[in-house]
């Protein structure tokens, strides 16, 4: 499929001008290659009319130009002094005319309307309101006022001052007679339809002395705005329908076959299943405007979209609308990344998030899509060291591996973590990507004790058992804080006995904390990685208490305090029942979602200093 995109149809009137924008992927080659506009012949072939290399056909001399905008990946063809001879099939394209890097455009130039003298022209958008003003003389002030529409050769009554309304206009038309001082009546037609277009005649009086005024009503179907976005990227439709529909239900729909327009999302709570997890309808302003964000763009998302307002929350005749033609460029600069990541209860996931390399200095975010109402995506973590309180100790955003990708790790998974998450930055909004986390049956691969209590001044050893499947991976322990997880020294204690059917390649790697201090309290993770690519992690909360009896503590899986809702099995391993392993004193639901801040002279969340209090809350 050609990645070139432009308007499928362009309509204009003799004597007018048109401006045609064609989009192309802004690669280095494309930016500098020849751009052209050619007319398709009856026997195939395409005759160049104008190109970016300076050629202008004699047919276009003095009335056309072609301008390339390489930074936007667009070029624009302007054609003036149109005649009906210009109607036809054209191509805008790159390179050689016959090569196929082009887009077909149909140009239709119609004759201007043949209007009677003294005809007032009203040009109004579909779904909007028109007011036709009809002046009259004093002698007709008390006489019948009427509006007719010319249908073929005959005028058909639309409305009159005696109360008649043509059935085609019921509920959307009124006739207003101004105060006695003004010799004027007006007819207001709402929710204009395409079929309302035509010649009207307003009349005051019925005899030969009646006052008449001709009006020509043109109802414009909105020209779709062209939108060119990358596969896997995102698009935002900004819909401004005007304050008169501020309190009417809004919708975005996608045109399917014929005139059908399938609702994608509306303010009445409807959402198409294909857009689950990747759409937001941002609430409307007082002036009735709203926006819809769609992320994780797919090939099949391409097409014509309409936004509108109607009490039913879907397209009806007379809905005011705005239109877009979305083209999804399959030659995407956005790299493929998994759209579904699976994890087990008690286990973890590591999500790779792509971003635009040019924006390495931007703030990175991860948010959880919520489908309630019109969809929203509250942030959970950012690259500046903020983590939402409920996720402390089990969520981290790492700038690694860098160069266009960051990593998000979420552990202590429960069934409540299943859902859609968005990767985004505060830079190029087109690079939002979506990932669905699914919680599947199974056991976590890494085995660690439950919550552990260390004694001030003593030594603590915490084991982590790695199955043989991770034999080629780097194994690590780290201490979690808001800014990431600071690596700590660990000891390989040889093969682990924690796995059935697992050979000598399984491993027991221990974390040792010597001379435990209050600053050692907190969350510790053990995990695996390959270079800068992170795999599974497991979390342990280490509490610190006053000395009771001397000696060091060597924590085994069986001896560790079982976290709430856990059973200690005979084998010495924990069975985690869909609950996050948390310090019992810090249940997220009970914890105030504070957003405290480190002081100017302190660090945001230091591994080496600071008390447990400084680690708590939603600190940053």
């Amino acid at each position: 499929k050609s990645p070139i995109f432009g308007p499928e149809e362009v309509n204009s009137v003799e004597g007018n001008s048109v401006s045609i924008t064609c989009y192309y992927p802004p690669t280095s080659v494309n930016r500098h290659t020849r751009k052209y506009w050619c007319r398709q012949g009856a026997r195939g072939g395409c005759i160049t009319l104008i190109s970016s290399e300076g050629y202008v056909s004699s047919k276009y001399a003095g009335r056309a130009n072609l301008t390339n905008f390489p930074e936007n990946g667009t070029f624009v063809v302007n054609i003036a002094q149109l005649s009906q001879d210009d109607s036809g099939r054209y191509k805008c394209g790159l390179g050689i005319n016959s090569r196929g890097l082009s887009f077909d455009v149909s140009l239709e130039v119609s004759q201007g309307p043949g209007l009677l003298n003294d005809t007032k022209v009203y040009t109004v958008d579909l779904g909007r309101t028109v007011t036709i003003n009809c002046p009259f003389k004093t002698e007709n002030a008390q006489k019948r006022k009427s509006l007719y529409k010319q249908i073929g050769l005959y005028p058909v009554l639309v409305i009159d001052s005696s109360g008649y309304v043509n059935p085609n206009y019921t509920g959307r038309i009124r006739l207003d007679i101004q105060g006695t001082g003004q010799l004027l009546f007006s007819v207001v037609i709402n929710q204009l339809r395409l079929s309302d277009a035509g010649q009207y005649l307003c009349q005051a009086g019925d005899d030969s002395n009646s006052n008449k005024k001709n009006a020509d009503l043109q109802v414009l179907k909105p020209e779709p705005e062209l939108v060119y976005e990358d596969l896997r990227g995102s698009v935002t439709f900004h819909c401004a329908l005007g304050p008169e529909v501020a309190n009417v239900a809004k919708f975005l729909c996608r045109q399917s076959s014929g005139e059908n327009c399938d609702v994608v999302v509306n303010t009445l709570g409807k959402r198409a299943p294909a857009f689950e997890g990747r759409i937001l309808l941002n609430p409307q302003d007082k002036d009735g405007s709203f926006s819809v964000v769609i992320t994780g763009l797919r090939k099949e998302d391409a097409g014509r979209y309409l936004c509108g307002a109607h009490s039913d929350g879907q397209l009806q005749e007379g809905s005011p609308i705005q239109a877009w033609q979305l083209f999804v460029n399959e030659e995407s600069t956005i790299p493929r990344s998994p759209t579904v990541v699976k994890g087990v209860a008690g286990g973890s996931v590591a999500v790779l998030c792509p971003y635009n390399r040019k924006e390495s200095k931007s703030i990175k975010y991860w948010c959880l899509w919520e489908g309630a109402q019109n969809g929203r995506c509250p942030l959970l973590v950012d690259s500046e060291g903020w983590v939402k309180a409920q996720y402390e100790g089990r969520l981290s955003l790492l700038e690694e591996p860098g160069n266009g990708t960051f990593t998000v790790i979420l552990n202590q998974l429960t069934s409540r973590d299943a859902g859609f998450y968005w990767c985004l930055t505060n830079g190029d909004t087109l690079w939002r990507t979506t990932v669905e986390i699914k919680i599947i049956e199974g056991e976590p691969n890494l085995k660690v004790p439950g919550n552990v209590t260390a004694v001030l001044g003593e030594t603590l050893k915490v084991p982590c058992h790695f199955p043989c499947k991770f034999s080629s991976y780097e194994k690590y322990w780290c201490k979690w804080n808001n800014t990431g997880c600071q690596a700590l020294p660990s000891q390989d204690e040889g093969p682990s006995k924690a796995f059935v059917n697992c050979d000598e390649n399984s491993r027991l790697v221990s974390l040792t904390l010597n001379l435990v201090t209050r600053a050692d309290e907190g969350w510790y993770w053990c995990g695996v990685k390959q270079g800068h690519f992170y795999g599974e992690t497991a979390a342990v909360y280490v509490a610190v208490e006053e000395r009771k009896a001397a000696g060091s503590r060597d924590v085994s899986l069986a001896k560790a305090d079982a976290a709430p809702d856990e059973k200690v099995l005979d084998s010495g391993f924990r069975e985690i029942e869909n609950k996050a392993i948390q310090d019992p004193r810090l249940f997220a639901e009970e914890k105030a979602v504070a957003d405290t801040r480190d002081q100017a002279d302190g660090s945001r969340a230091s591994v080496d200093s600071g008390s447990s209090e400084e680690q708590g809350g939603s600190s940053r």
């Epitope: 900004h238 937001l280 941002n282 609430p283 409307q284 302003d285 405007s289 709203f290 926006s291 964000v293 924006e359 200095k361 931007s362 703030i363 975010y365 948010c367 929203r376 995506c377 509250p378 942030l379 950012d382 500046e384 060291g385 903020w386 968005w422 985004l424 930055t425 505060n426 830079g427 909004t429 939002r432 957003d595 801040r597 480190d598 002081q599 100017a600 002279d601 302190g602 660090s603 945001r604 940053r620």
Partner: nanobody, 130 residues
């Protein structure tokens, strides 16, 4: 305690210029991105511009692009907003803020709230009128 104090607002004619300042204290200013947000009379909050911690990554709302310039001096713990070619529609109370906590990015038009940022200043009034 985090404190953000804006200054530099005032009355200016269309086409004129103003420079807003925001003095920050109570946190490690040089480590966080900062934001300018405004609220026009009778309207909702509107995000204006963002600068990252190092001052080397900057973005603007379309409505101010090419006219406003955000900058920061980490040695002085101060954020700036240089506003040129001012228009009547720039009339608003301007706030500096830090720690975006809202729903997705950019802050969706018409939905931005004070709660979407960790800390706010008290604001400075900018009036553009002839």
């Amino acid at each position: 305690e985090v404190q953000l104090v804006e200054s530099g607002g005032g009355l200016v004619q269309p086409g004129g210029s103003l420079r807003l300042s925001c003095a920050a204290s109570g946190f490690a200013f040089s480590r966080y991105g900062m934001y300018w947000v405004r609220q026009a009379p009778g309207k909702g909050l509107e995000w204006v511009s963002t600068i990252n911690s190092g001052g080397d990554y900057i973005i603007y709302a379309d409505s101010v692009k090419g006219r406003f310039t955000i900058s920061r001096d980490n040695a002085k713990n101060t954020l700036y907003l240089q506003m040129n070619s001012l228009k009547p529609e720039d009339t608003a109370v301007y706030y500096c803020a830090e720690g975006y906590r809202g729903s997705e990015w950019p802050p969706p038009a018409f939905t931005l709230q004070r709660a979407d940022f960790a800390s706010w200043g008290q604001g400075t009034q900018v009036t553009v009128s002839s």
